[in-house]
């Protein structure tokens, strides 16, 4: 099948006092090979500070995956989700505390 770019969605949720969990979800992409990771000040976080979801079929002929990490509240602007798929790449910021969803369709 032809390449289908992912929709990337960054969300945040309260983790513990002073911390938040930020989750970057990529969905609706094909083929299944994808790079998804969190960066702090443009530098990739170490593997053991991130939790990855499996790349799984979504039942529509495309795939989905996610990566999450825990960060200090107030430092959101230093973190971005980096996505690379089929030669294309993009970065996605953490939404501010007021808005909980950011949808970007990557082309």
């Amino acid at each position: 099948g032809s390449t289908v770019p992912p929709m990337v969605n960054v969300t945040r949720s309260e983790a513990s006092e002073g911390n938040i969990t930020v989750t970057c979800r990529a969905s609706g992409f094909y083929p299944w090979n994808i790079t998804l990771s969190w960066r702090q000040d443009g530098v990739s976080l170490s593997h053991d500070t991130q939790q990855w979801g499996d790349v799984l079929p979504d039942g529509n002929g495309t795939y989905q995956t996610w990566v999450a990490t825990r960060i200090c509240q107030g430092e959101e602007q230093r973190f971005t989700c980096y996505m690379e798929h089929s030669g294309n790449h993009s970065t996605h910021p953490v939404p501010s505390g007021n808005s909980h969803h950011h949808h970007h369709h990557h082309h």
Epitope: T23, S27, W32, Q51, G53, D54, V55, L56, P57, D58, G59, N60, Q64, W66, A68
Partner: antibody, heavy 122, light 112 residues
Amino acid sequence: QGQMQQSGAELVKPGASVKLSCKTSGFTFSDNYISWLKQKPGQSLEWIAWIYAGTGGTSYNQKFTAKAQLTVDTSSSTAYMQFSSLTTEDSAIYYCARHDYYGTSGAWFAYWGQGTLVTVSA
Amino acid sequence: DVLMTQTPLSLPVSLGDQASLSCRSSQNIVHINGNTYLEWYLQKPGQSPKLLIYKVSNRFSGVPDRFSGSGSGTDFTLKISRVEAEDLGVYYCFQGSHVPWTFGGGTKVEIK
């Protein structure tokens, strides 16, 4: 972990259809893959199909593609399986089970409903 | 379809014994994403199955550490280090890597 409450036992006639439900609570429904499984008395389990509640996308065991149809109602956090053209071979317990995609477990059937007994008899 | 073969069919044990259950798949069960979705479930009479082990060797939350899973390729093992009364029932292995997902025929662990 939340709850998965399945509908009650069904006694149906051959050739008829039945729609089983799996009502969920206590977790984010749209984050889950909901599977349906079949078990005849004293036998092993058979996977029928899954539906990803977030999109309604499905994957079927080819053996059941003409027999089963999976749907979800996100407003009531309920998964359904319509089973058609029933024969006595379809008499079994049917389970729903879920995989929480954004949870910590990479297991397909981490949590189960209590099962629904379907009896097909003239 | 991937055939999952479990041995033995029945495993008589004494409480406190170690039990070893085997599961063999008819082909390699590594998923396209690199994971091996080999899981173990325990079903007691009149109950729904319960997850014990996922991805070959990961214990599910709340599962006692006397349960351990191992294996790779096509051969997998579930070990119970000291069998307790609550461990009696039918154990099923399952592969969720290749559609259609398939279960083994089960191993019944019972008192000797």
